[in-house]
Interface confidence: medium
Amino acid sequence: MVLEVSDHQVLNDAEVAALLENFSSSYDYGENESDSCCTSPPCPQDFSLNFDRAFLPALYSLLFLLGLLGNGAVAAVLLSRRTALSSTDTFLLHLAVADTLLVLTLPLWAVDAAVQWVFGSGLCKVAGALFNINFYAGALLLACISFDRYLNIVHATQLYRRGPPARVTLTCLAVWGLCLLFALPDFIFLSAHHDERLNATHCQYNFPQVGRTALRVLQLVAGFLLPLLVMAYCYAHILAVLLVSRGQRRLRAMRLVVVVVVAFALCWTPYHLVVLVDILMDLGALARNCGRESRVDVAKSVTSGLGYMHCCLNPLLYAFVGVKFRERMWMLLLRLGCPNQRGLQRQPSSSRRDSSWSETSEASYSGL
C-alpha cells in the first residue's frame, strides 16, 4: 500500500565493488560494524518492486470488486430491515462501511504499484488516511462486537439494551474518532514524493525513522494485538459459559462469531509477523541484509494482500455460515426483482425478537 522507504546506511566503496561484481547476495552486517561509516549491504530494490508491479494491481483490482459487491450486499441487507438494528447489527453495518471505504482506495494503490502515484499529494493524504482509518476501524469494531457479546452472554448484561441507538452510535463514533486520531500521521506526513532512487513519484511517508517505527508499533498493537486479545478473551469466556450451560442453540449461533474472529486472526497475523520482523530490523535487534530485506518487502506485499482480503471475507462468511443472512439476501433480491410483491419482505424475525434469551444474551449475529 503506502510505500515505506526504509532507512539504509550509506554504501562505502567496498560494498560498491561488491555490487558491481554481483557479490551482494550473501552480505550481512551486525552491531560491531555500526561505528564504521556507511557499511551497508548493497540492496537493489528491483526484485521487490517488480514483484509489486506484477502482483499488487491484479490482487487489488480483484479485492476492490469483491469487497464492493460483498460489503454492499451486507449493508443492503442490514439497511433493508424494518425493525431497529441490534447492537451487533449496527457494529456490522459500520464494519461493512469500513471495509467498503478501505477497498475503495485499492484502485489508487494498484495504480501506485503498477506505475506511480499520479493523483497528487492531497489525494495521497486522503487515501492513506482513509485506508488506515478503515484498517483500524475493522479491527476495533470486531473487538466491540466481541465485547458486546461477552457482556450479553457472560454477564447477562445488555450494555446497549436501553436506548441501543444512542449507546451503539456513541461507541461507533468513539471508534471512528480513535481511528481518525490514529490516521493523523497520514494527514500530516503522507505526500507524493518523486523518489530519485526509483525515478518515480510515490505516495510516501516523510518523517524520521523513529516515527516510522513508532507508527508500525502503534499499528501492530492498536490495529491487531489489542483487538485480537479482546476477541480471544471475550470469546474464550463466551464459549466456556455456553459449554457449561449446554446451550446447543447458542453454540450454533456462536459459530459465525468464532469463524469471523478466526478469519481476522488468519488474515492479519502473517502481515503483522512480517511487520514485527521489520520493526526488529529497524531497532537493530535483527541484522539487515539484502536477502532478508528483499524477502521482507515481498512478504509484506503478499501478507498485506492477505490482510486486505479480510475485507471481502466477512460478507462471504455471513453468506456461507450465517443462515439469516442468506435468507435476508434472498428476500432482498426477490424484492428488488419483484417490487410489487410486498409480502415477501415480511420476514420471520419476530420469533427471534420474542425469544427470551435473545433479549438478554443473544449469541448470534442477530441480523445475519
Epitope: 554504501l11 556507511c38 530519485e196
Partner: antibody, heavy 123, light 106 residues
Framework: EVQLLESGGGLVQPGGSLRLSCAAS????????MSWVRQAPGKGLEWVAT????????YYPDSVKGRFTISRDNAKNTLYLQMNSLRAEDTAVYYC????????????????WGQGTLVTVSS | DIQLTQSPSFLSASVGDRVTITCRAS?????LYWYQQKPGKAPKLWIY???TLAPGVPSRFSGSGSGNEYTLTISSLQPEDFATYYC?????????FGQGTKLEIK
C-alpha cells in the same frame, strides 16, 4: 536546481557550543544521505559527520565523536550539526554536502556542496 | 586511517599543457574521487569511481589508477582549470581527503 544553504556560523569561545543548519532545496531531501565537511583556513578538507536519509544512521570520525551531533528534520528539509566542547582546531568553514545515489543506494562521496559557513573558535 | 598524499602540492603550468596530478593511498582503496575548488568557493565533484567524469566536466579531464596509486590528467590546460584539486577515498572510515594540489598559471 540543487541548493544547500548553510547558516549558524560565528565566533565562539573554546568549550562553547554552536548549532549549524543547512537548508536544502531543489531535490527530494528525504531520499538522500547528507554530510558535513569542514575546511580549516588555508588547509584541506576534512569529513565531519554523515546521516542516512531517514536519520537512523549517523557516523563521525574520532576527531569529533562525542562532541558533534548530526541530525535532520525531513519535514523542514533541514540538516543540522550541533557542536559542543568546541576547540581552536575546530575553526573552519563548514560545508553541508549531499551523497549521491548509486543503484538504489547511497554512495559515500559528495555530489553537491553548500557555500559553507565560517566557525571561529577563539577566546 | 588511510592517508592520501597528493603530488605535487603546487603545480605551475601554462595554458595548453598536459598536466598529471597523483594521489597515493597508504592502503589500497577501491575507488578514488576528485574535487575541484576555486578560491572562496565550495568544492565541486569532478571525477567519481576513479574515472567517471561528473556532469559538466570537460572531456580533457581523465582519471585512472587502482590500488594505491591514482592520477588525474588534464590533456590540455584551459584558463578555467586553474584551481585546487583534492582526492578523496571512501573505502574505510574515516573518509579522508588528500592535502590538495594547487594548480597555478605559470
Amino acid at each position: 536546481e540543487v541548493q544547500l544553504l548553510e547558516s549558524g556560523g560565528g565566533l565562539v569561545q573554546p568549550g562553547g557550543s554552536l548549532r549549524l543548519s543547512c537548508a536544502a532545496s531543489g531535490f527530494t531531501f528525504t531520499s538522500y544521505a547528507m554530510s558535513w565537511v569542514r575546511q580549516a583556513p588555508g588547509k584541506g578538507l576534512e569529513w565531519v559527520a554523515t546521516i542516512s536519509h531517514g536519520g537512523t544512521y549517523t557516523y563521525y570520525p574520532d576527531s569529533v565523536k562525542g562532541r558533534f551531533t548530526i541530525s535532520r528534520d525531513n519535514a523542514k528539509n533541514t540538516l543540522y550539526l550541533q557542536m559542543n566542547s568546541l576547540r581552536a582546531e575546530d575553526t573552519a568553514v563548514y560545508y553541508c554536502a549531499r551523497h549521491p545515489i548509486y543503484s538504489g543506494n547511497y554512495q559515500g562521496y559528495f555530489d553537491y556542496w553548500g557555500q559553507g559557513t565560517l566557525v571561529t573558535v577563539s577566546s | 586511517d588511510i592517508q592520501l598524499t597528493q603530488s605535487p602540492s603546487f603545480l605551475s603550468a601554462s595554458v595548453g599543457d598536459r598536466v598529471t596530478i597523483t594521489c597515493r593511498a597508504s592502503s589500497g582503496v577501491n575507488y578514488l574521487y576528485w574535487y575541484q575548488q576555486k578560491p572562496g568557493k565550495a568544492p565541486k565533484l569532478w571525477i567519481y569511481f576513479t574515472s567517471t567524469l561528473a556532469p559538466g566536466v570537460p572531456s580533457r579531464f581523465s582519471g585512472s589508477g587502482s590500488g594505491n596509486e591514482y592520477t588525474l590528467t588534464i590533456s590540455s590546460l584551459q584558463p578555467e582549470d586553474f584551481a585546487t584539486y583534492y582526492c578523496q577515498q571512501f573505502t574505510s572510515s574515516p573518509y579522508t581527503f588528500g592535502q590538495g594540489t594547487k594548480l597555478e598559471i605559470k
